[in-house]
Amino acid sequence: IWELKKDVYVVELDWYPDAPGEMVVLTCDTPEEDGITWTLDQSSEVLGSGKTLTIQVKEFGDAGQYTCHKGGEVLSHSLLLLHKKEDGIWSTDILKDQKEPKNKTFLRCEAKNYSGRFTCWWLTTISTDLTFSVKSSRGSSDPQGVTCGAATLSAERVRGDNKEYEYSVECQEDSACPAAEESLPIEVMVDAVHKLKYENYTSSFFIRDIIKPDPPKNLQLKPLKNSRQVEVSWEYPDTWSTPHSYFSLTFCVQVQGKSKREKKDRVFTDKTSATVICRKNASISVRAQDRYYSSSWSEWASVPCS
Amino acid sequence: RAVPGGSSPAWTQCQQLSQKLCTLAWSAHPLVGHMDLREEGDEETTNDVPHIQCGDGCDPQGLRDNSQFCLQRIHQGLIFYEKLLGSDIFTGEPSLLPDSPVAQLHASLLGLSQLLQPEGHHWETQQIPSLSPSQPWQRLLLRFKILRSLQAFVAVAARVFAHGAATLSP
């Protein structure tokens, strides 16, 4: 058993049929010695008396808020949550496996630049009685500070018969060094509590590996005289690290016909303009990627040819 | 050439070669799925790899103030990785093809380090480990890990030379 926060405790249980469970001793936080009784949740049934209560925790029915009283007055509370371990593996019932980029990916994170700011998100089908708490650090043995905000519900989607809820959190490295080569990864730890079930999820990454620039901005076309060619120009996204002579991007320019089956013409360039042939009913799209490190491409910025 | 405490490097040449290094490092080890190559430290973990750290002056301001500190650190890393790519980790079984990106990468690391340091002057360099793994798959795993680290190192070096070529070239 360990303390998650004040008066909230997590009991780690090996979860299998007829498992013996864990013996837990609760102590009433009071100077009083006599006349103390214990109850669980809203029930008025007295579970025991005395300053300590010993219970055998085997299932969710044994978890909940234990309260010690004296003469009708509440003295203190202890909330017991369960953390299930099945076949040596901690349960992952609360969050959905996003399966990208690999199986057992529960947390996904992205950064728009090298400032040390990043966003993580996760999915669940649970709509109520759900709380999250997020902690992060750079490295684990001698951790350097990363500050995370509160997790918030950022999207709701309908998937077949189910509703899916996306939660996200923003974190910022306290002493970020955008120009340095990272040698220690960022660690993100999410505590999830659904009713009386506790689970924890972790992710470890380098900012450089989760970089995904915003799409290029101000995408414009300039027709060239007496030609089917156009000059496409764009600018670095506002959210990208500066100076651009140091934090450079490379770009992919694509001409795509109305039909998805039509052949796509692609040009790669380090410049912020390119000359392409604009076909009727086609559209021109541009996306960006770090020039020197192959992290994710941005989403496309697009304009119609006409 | 970057004579320590002296003249500037050939920024544009360094920029071109460092950008080529980035391309080669990624073609030598493209991201295979999402390989879990996390390092698990234990009580004896010592990191002898020269990383470009915050205080090395490789940020835009540090380069403007005095690029020598940064160039020295980059040179140190280039020599370290050049020695690694020439060691039995890469030359032992399983054999690499003679024209593999690793062979070109090895040559380009040497080329860039020579652009940075003239003959006759030696900056301090890190030693590569002496105790080498005996099994081919151990070498294969280390190749992946070394190339992943090299990708990160050359990305920072390429940013330095790109910025230098754009802002510090005579």
Epitope: - | T46, S134, L141, L142
Partner: antibody, heavy 127, light 108 residues
Amino acid sequence: QVQLVQSGAEVKKPGSSVKVSCKASGGTFSSNYISWVRQAPGQGLEWMGGIIPIFGHANYAQKFQGRVTITADESTSTAYMELSSLRSEDTAVYYCARSKKGMYGGWTYPLMMFDLWGQGTLVTVSS
Amino acid sequence: DIVLTQSPATLSLSPGERATLSCRASQSVSSNYLAWYQQKPGQAPRLLIYYASRRATGVPARFSGSGSGTDFTLTISSLEPEDFATYYCQQTSNTPFTFGQGTKVEIK
């Protein structure tokens, strides 16, 4: 802490096959080397083979080549050892073991020395 | 295959005495890829020494390893009651990774 948890004891008939599992909890599974070592009653230790899950490629002791198959499932952090054409002399405790990490420069790699062992699975081959 | 021969097969000593266990290889073990394990009845082996002379995590200082090439030694400077067990050497220089037949250290 990291643990290797093996499947339960098995009783098999000669000529049949047995598949023993080894589940890792905690730590990085993918780039570790998981070996299988057996110990016949009152006898010494015998290395059978091992796998590095990230590559999916196993290597085997010549003695067991063709009879043993070692596999790994990265998604469940589980390694498996299947031994076929069982004979009475295959009666033994079968251990899975994880390699100690060595250092090369700043990079860890698995040595072939085993610092973490499963609890063992007794396989009895008897008609 | 590299054959490892351990001697003696059994060592009868009293607590507090010094134990010296030998492991001889049929050919040179490169880079000192040699390990020592301790095994007690009904338990899995425990790694004591790797790289011939480095103590594994949590192993008491009374255990030390030495040697190179073909001759290796495990020394227990002063036997504690919990040290009475069987000790195996293992080479990981070449596949297959072979073990010695073991030395049993018993109470005299």
